[in-house]
Amino acid sequence: KESCDVQLYIKRQSEHSILAGDPFELECPVKYCANRPHVTWCKLNGTTCVKLEDRQTSWKEEKNISFFILHFEPVLPNDNGSYRCSANFQSNLIESHSTTLYVTDVKSASERPSKDEMASRPWLLYR
């Protein structure tokens, strides 16, 4: 008889580069046998992972795998950071590898001083 654990398929050092202001879906691939497990997302903050309980999430079911999705509508600059998904089943908790979002703030990127400005006013680098 084959073992039937809930499984989370986020690879080591998974990362996404995204733009602030855009919508984004962060997927946690989940495999389960019978009953769909309770899955949550959390964001790493120091030594703890803070549950994201008030955020919009949804499930996407495919033939051999399901995805528990954390929605960013839109992405904000402070969404930058590392996230984990975790699943509860049979009183066990399993936590995925962390997945990191690198958020580029388009607004601040477009407002960066030019090379000429930085050459004449190097203190702008330290703002």
Epitope: S3, Y9, K11, R12, Q13, L44, N64, I94, H97
Partner: antibody, heavy 118, light 106 residues
């Protein structure tokens, strides 16, 4: 129950290749990744790489170009081939199953001794 | 790659006494650390994952702790069957193991 049973000991000449098999039972290779770890005599453990559920691979850069990991889901068997063997490759080679979250190795094969000697 | 430096290389402890093994990562690995026990002639066995979670069937005298770069495996009261080599392993990036600690009875 979960088991990983590896092929028998091998003796190879320098420059040759070796292919070690790992037959699993109690779980499916379409559901779990499998790692390969080696241990030289009296030494520590060295991760060689792994094969994911979809057949994609992730190799330790120290073995890149010399190691190939494959699997046959229908035979529930994973293979690790190491080429251009040298005496430093003499070691016990283990296959090990990834935990359901991929963050540790929970079941290990019994090991396969590979001796490289001229 | 991330280097895991384990100390001490060997340790002799009296039966019933506490044994402490340390592991230091060359960079932060969050809590992505596992500990394994290997007895002579056997394959490694998983003891601890997520740095502090005891694996199924592992006696509660084994405790893992730490976060970031510094990790510890503690055996609160050494038993004869605990004589083995212990390895830490990081799984934050491409997995690497510590060099091992040989635990013996004093």
């Amino acid at each position: 129950q979960v088991q990983l049973v590896q092929s028998g000991a091998e003796v190879k000449k320098p420059g040759a290749s070796v292919k070690v098999s790992c037959k699993v039972s109690g779980f499916s290779l379409t559901g779990y990744g499998v790692n390969w770890v080696r241990q030289a005599p009296g030494q520590g453990l060295e991760w060689m790489g792994m094969i994911w559920i979809d057949g994609s691979t992730d190799y330790n850069s120290a073995f890149q170009g010399r190691v190939t990991m494959t699997k046959d889901n229908s035979k529930s068997t994973v293979y690790m081939e190491l080429s251009s063997l040298r005496s430093e490759d003499t070691a016990v080679y283990y296959c090990a199953r990834d935990r359901p979250d991929g963050r540790a190795m929970d079941y290990w094969g019994q090991g396969t001794m590979v001796t490289v000697s001229s | 790659s991330i280097v895991m430096t384990q100390s001490p290389d060997s340790l002799a402890v009296s039966l019933g006494e506490r044994a402490t093994i340390n592991c230091k990562a060359s960079q932060s690995v969050s809590n992505d650390v596992a500990w394994y026990q290997q007895k002579p002639g056997q394959s490694p066995k998983l003891l601890i994952y997520y740095a502090s979670n005891r694996y199924t069937g592992v006696p509660d005298r084994f405790t893992g702790s730490g976060y970031g770069t510094d990790f510890t495996l503690t055996i609160s009261s050494l038993q004869a069957e605990d004589v083995a080599v212990y390895f830490c392993q990081q799984d934050y990036s491409s997995p690497t193991f510590g060099g091992g600690t040989k635990l013996e009875i004093k």
